[in-house]
Interface confidence: low
C-alpha cells in the first residue's frame, strides 16, 4: 500500500526487570526526512485533540533537544532509514505497547511494538530430537528469546548437575526478523545416559544463576548383558558339567528374545537365560556368549572361553622342508591336539629316541646325509601321554661326493694320442644324471661319465669333470701332461744388431717356444752340411763365402722340428776388379772397342770411375767404356774403380793396343 509507512522489526520483545531491551528497527517514510519522533508507552488516540495520549519515554524535536530524564531510553536511528531503540535498564512497568510516533513534513505515522518484561529472568527452552539412540550423535539446542548489547548473558549445559565437557556453540541474533540467544551442543549419548537429567542454565556475565530448563534423556539402546559361568574359570575336563547364566542390566525398550552363540554360531533350542552343558566333550570347547534383542537391535555379552581339557591325541610330524639340501637347516614340528598344551615331547629318529629333544620343535642347523630317515614324536600334558603317530620321512639331498677325474691311458700321453678319461664319484642323492667337462671341446662321450679325446693336442693341459644330480660337483682338474716335439723353431740373429759386414763377429740363435719333455738337442746345417750342435752358431770373422741358407733343428725324445731356412747375407766392398776388353786387347783403328769393369761386391757396385795411364779420370761412370771409332792415340793402359755402400776397390792396369788399318798404311 503506497499510502503507508513501511516498518520492519520484531513483533514482540522479551526481557526481565533490570535487564535491557535492544529493538532493531528499519523504516521508510512516505515523503522526505523524519522531522519529529516520540516514543510512547501504551499510547491511546484522543479523538478530541486528534493526538495520542500516553507516557512519553522519548521525544526528539526539530531543534534536537532531549530532556535529561530520557537517557534510559535511546533512539539510535536516523531521519530516513533506521529506527533502532534501546531501553537500559528495562523495568517491569515497561511491559505493554511501545508507540513510535513519526512525523515528516507532510505525513504522520504511529508504529506499535510489544514489550514483555517479566519480574524474574525467564527460563530458556531445551529442544531435543524426536528419538535418541546410543552412540548416534545428536544436537541439543537451548533457545532464549532475549539478546541485548548492554546485558551480556551465557548459556551453560549440565548433565546430572555437572558441566558437560563437550564444547557448545553459542550464537545470538539481533535483527529486524528475530532476537534470541541460542546454544547448540553436539553429543553422542551412551546407554548409561538413559534417564539422566540435562540442564540448560542461564547465567549473567559473572556466571550468576538466572534461570534454567531441564529435560530427562530417553536413550534407546540394545540390551546390556552380563554372563556368569560355573565353574568361574570355565576350565573343565571331559565329562564335567558347565552352567552359564545371562543377566540383562539395561534395555530400552524392553527386550523381546534371548539366544546363545558358540564361536559366533547360534545354538539351536537354547532360548532361556540359562545354558546347561552336561558331560562336555572337547568339541564343546570354544567362545560362548548370550544374545538378547529389542527393537533397537541385538545386544551381546562378553565371550566366555570354555576350555575342555583332554590328553594329547596321536601326533603327526611336519618337516620344513623335505627333501632337504645338505648343509641347509631343517625344522621338525610335533603336532598333537591337546588341552592344556603339551609340556613335554619325546622324539624318535628311525624308531630310536633322540636324547635331549623335549621341545615341540627340533631344529637341525646343518643337515648331513645321516640325518635322513623317519621322524616321529609323542606329546605329553598333565592329563596323560599321547600315542606316537606314523612319522614323516626326511630325504637329504646332496651334491655328488668325492668326484675325481681319472686318466685311463698309460702315461706318458703324446701329442696325437687318443685319451680316455672317466669321472668317478663316491655317493650321490639324487642319482647322478649327467656329467660336465672343462674345458669344452669337440670330444666324444661314448658312455655316461667317460670322455674320449681323439688326437690330443699339445696344449691340452688340464681336464676337470663334474658329476651332476640337482647340482654339479667338480673334481680337481687333472694334468694330461701331453708330451710333444719342440714347437715354433726359428733362427734368430743375435749379433751384430745391424747388417753383417765382411769381417764382423756373427752369432745366430736357434729359438723354440716350448718342448715337452724339456731336454733337447740342437743341429745347425748349411746346404745339407752339419755345422754345429749348440743352440748358437758363431762366426769370429765372417767372410762373403759364409753367406748362404742356414737351418737349425731341435729334437727331444718325441721328435725333431726344423726351422725355416734363414738366409745369411754378408756385405763387402768391391773386390776382384779387372778390366776386360772386347773384342780383345788389340783393335784396329776405326773399329769399336768396349772396356768392361768387372767386380765382386755386395751390395753391387753403385758407381764406377775410369782412369788412363796417366791416372787421369775419364768422364765416364758406367760399368762399360765404349770407344768408337777407336784411334791409335787410344792405345795405353786403363784401370777402373768401383764403389758401393761398404767401400771402394780398384782394378790392375790393362793395356789396349790400337794398330793402323791397311788404308792408313797404304797412304803412307
Amino acid at each position: 500500500d503506497s499510502s503507508k509507512w513501511v516498518f520492519e522489526h520484531p513483533e514482540t520483545l522479551y526481557a526481565w526487570e533490570g535487564a535491557c531491551v535492544w529493538i532493531p528497527c528499519t523504516y521508510r517514510a512516505l515523503d522526505g526526512d523524519l522531522e519529529s519522533f516520540i516514543l510512547f508507552h501504551n499510547p491511546e488516540y484522543n479523538k478530541n485533540t486528534s493526538k495520542f495520549d500516553g507516557t512519553r519515554l522519548y521525544e526528539s524535536t526539530k531543534d534536537g533537544k532531549v530532556p535529561s530524564e530520557q537517557k534510559r531510553v535511546q533512539f539510535l536511528g536516523d531521519k530516513n532509514k533506521n529506527c533502532t531503540l534501546s531501553i537500559h535498564p528495562v523495568h517491569l512497568n515497561d511491559s505493554g505497547q511501545l508507540g513510535l510516533r513519526m512525523e515528516s513534513k507532510t505525513e504522520k505515522w504511529m508504529e506499535r511494538i510489544h514489550l514483555n518484561v517479566s519480574e524474574r529472568p525467564f527460563p530458556p527452552h531445551i529442544q531435543l530430537p524426536p528419538e535418541i539412540q546410543e552412540s548416534q550423535e545428536v544436537t541439543l539446542t537451548c533457545l532464549l528469546n532475549f539478546s541485548c548489547y548492554g546485558y551480556p548473558i551465557q548459556l551453560q549445559w549440565l548433565l546430572e548437575g555437572v558441566p558437560m565437557r563437550q564444547a557448545a556453540v553459542t550464537s545470538t541474533s539481533l535483527t529486524i526478523k528475530s532476537v534470541f540467544t541460542r546454544s547448540e551442543l553436539k553429543f553422542s549419548p551412551q546407554w548409561s545416559h538413559h534417564g539422566k537429567i540435562v540442564t540448560c542454565q542461564l547465567q549473567d556475565a559473572d556466571g550468576k544463576f538466572l534461570s534454567n530448563d531441564t529435560v530427562q534423556l530417553n536413550v534407546k539402546h540394545t540390551p546390556k548383558l552380563e554372563i556368569k559361568v560355573t565353574p568361574s574359570d570355565a576350565i573343565v575336563r571331559e565329562g564335567d558339567s558347565v552352567t552359564m547364566t545371562c543377566e540383562v542390566s539395561s534395555s530400552n525398550p524392553e527386550y523381546t528374545t534371548v539366544s546363545w552363540l558358540k564361536d559366533g554360531t547360534s545354538l539351536k533350542k537354547q532360548n532361556t537365560f540359562t545354558l546347561n552343558l552336561r558331560e562336555v566333550t572337547k568339541d564343546q570347547s570354544g567362545k560362548y556368549c548370550c544374545q538378547v534383542s529389542n527393537d533397537v537391535g541385538p545386544g551381546r555379552s562378553e565371550e566366555v572361553f570354555l576350555q575342555v581339557q583332554y590328553a594329547p591325541e596321536p601326533s603327526t610330524v611336519q618337516i620344513l622342508h623335505s627333501p632337504a639340501v645338505e648343509g641347509s637347516q631343517v625344522e621338525f614340528l610335533c603336532m598333537s591336539l591337546a588341552n592344556p598344551l603339551p609340556t613335554n615331547y619325546t622324539w624318535y629318529h628311525n624308531g630310536k629316541e633322540m636324547q635331549g629333544r623335549t621341545e615341540e620343535k627340533v631344529h637341525i642347523p646343518k643337515i648331513l646325509p645321516w640325518h635322513a630317515g623317519t621322524y616321529s614324536c609323542v606329546a605329553e600334558n598333565i592329563l596323560g601321554t599321547g600315542q606316537r603317530g606314523p612319522g614323516a620321512e626326511l630325504d637329504v639331498q646332496y651334491p655328488p661326493k668325492k668326484v675325481t677325474t681319472v686318466i685311463q691311458n698309460p702315461m706318458p700321453i703324446r701329442e696325437g694320442d687318443t685319451v680316455t678319461l672317466s669321472c668317478n664319484y663316491n655317493s650321490s642323492n639324487p642319482s647322478v644324471t649327467r656329467y660336465e667337462w672343462k674345458p669344452h671341446g669337440a670330444w666324444e662321450e661314448p658312455s655316461l661319465g667317460v670322455l674320449k679325446i681323439q688326437n690330443v693336442g699339445w696344449d691340452n693341459t688340464t681336464i676337470a669333470c663334474a658329476a651332476c644330480n640337482s647340482w654339479c660337483s667338480w673334481a680337481s682338474p687333472v694334468a694330461l701332461n701331453v708330451q710333444y716335439a719342440p714347437r715354433d723353431v726359428r733362427v734368430r740373429k743375435i749379433k751384430p744388431l745391424s747388417e753383417i759386414h765382411s769381417g764382423n763377429s756373427v752369432s745366430l740363435q736357434c729359438d723354440f717356444s716350448s718342448s715337452h719333455p724339456k731336454e733337447v738337442q740342437f743341429f745347425w746345417e748349411k746346404n745339407g752340411r752339419l755345422l754345429g750342435k749348440e743352440s748358437q752358431l758363431n762366426f769370429d770373422s765372417i767372410s762373403p763365402e759364409d753367406a748362404g741358407s742356414y737351418s737349425c733343428w731341435v729334437n727331444n725324445s718325441i721328435g725333431q722340428t726344423a726351422s725355416k731356412a734363414w738366409t745369411l747375407e754378408v756385405l763387402y766392398a768391391p773386390r776382384r776388379l779387372r778390366v776386360s776388353m772386347s773384342p780383345g786387347d788389340q783393335v784396329m783403328e776405326g773399329k769399336s772397342a768396349t772396356l768392361t769393369c768387372e767386380s765382386d761386391a755386395n751390395p753391387p757396385v753403385s758407381h764406377y770411375t775410369w782412369f788412363d795411364w796417366n791416372n787421369q779420370s775419364l768422364p765416364y761412370h758406367s760399368q762399360k767404356l765404349r770407344l768408337e771409332p777407336v784411334k791409335v792415340q787410344h792405345s795405353g793402359a786403363y784401370w777402373c774403380q768401383g764403389t758401393n755402400s761398404v767401400g771402394k776397390g780398384r782394378s790392375p792396369l790393362s793395356t789396349l793396343t790400337v794398330y793402323y788399318s791397311p788404308e792408313t798404311i797404304g797412304r803412307r
Epitope: 639340501v325 646343518k366 660337483s473
Partner: nanobody, 127 residues
Framework: AVQLVESGGGLVQPGGSLRLSCAAS????????IGWFRQAPGKEREGVSC????????NYADSVKGRFTISRDNAKNTVYLQMNSLKPEDTAVYYC????????????????????WGKGTLVTVSS
C-alpha cells in the same frame, strides 16, 4: 697358500651402507661359486647371498632382498657384497665361502658344498 680374506666390515649407523670384499689367493676364483654367510651372536649361521662362477646367476635371502647386491670381478679374483639400508638386525660376522657344484640360481649356496671359507669380518649396525 689357498685362502679367502674378507674386508670392508665396521660400525655403521642404521640406514647406512657398507661394501664387503672377498679376495682369493692361491687359486682361481672363476672356477668357483661364491656364497656370503653371516652369524649373529648366539644365533645359527645363515646364508645371505650366492653368485655363480660366471656371475650370471644370483640369489638372496628374503631378509636382505632389495637391500644387498652381490657381484664379482674375476679379473681381480674378488667378490663383493654391497649392503644398503642397513638395519640393527644385520649385525653379524660375515663370511665368504667358495665351492664347486652345479648352480642354477634357484637356491642358496649349500654350506656343505663349500670348499674354502674365510675368517670373517664384523659388521655392526648401531646408532
Amino acid at each position: 697358500a689357498v685362502q679367502l680374506v674378507e674386508s670392508g666390515g665396521g660400525l655403521v649407523q642404521p640406514g647406512g651402507s657398507l661394501r664387503l670384499s672377498c679376495a682369493a689367493s692361491g687359486f682361481t676364483l672363476d672356477h668357483y661359486h661364491i656364497g656370503w654367510f653371516r652369524q649373529a651372536p648366539g644365533k645359527e649361521r645363515e646364508g645371505v647371498s650366492c653368485i655363480s662362477n660366471s656371475g650370471g646367476s644370483t640369489n638372496y635371502a628374503d631378509s636382505v632382498k632389495g637391500r644387498f647386491t652381490i657381484s664379482r670381478d674375476n679379473a681381480k679374483n674378488t667378490v663383493y657384497l654391497q649392503m644398503n639400508s642397513l638395519k640393527p638386525e644385520d649385525t653379524a660376522v660375515y663370511y665368504c665361502a667358495a665351492g664347486r657344484w652345479y648352480y642354477d640360481g634357484s637356491r642358496y649356496c649349500p654350506p656343505g658344498a663349500m670348499d674354502y671359507w674365510g675368517k670373517g669380518t664384523l659388521v655392526t649396525v648401531s646408532s
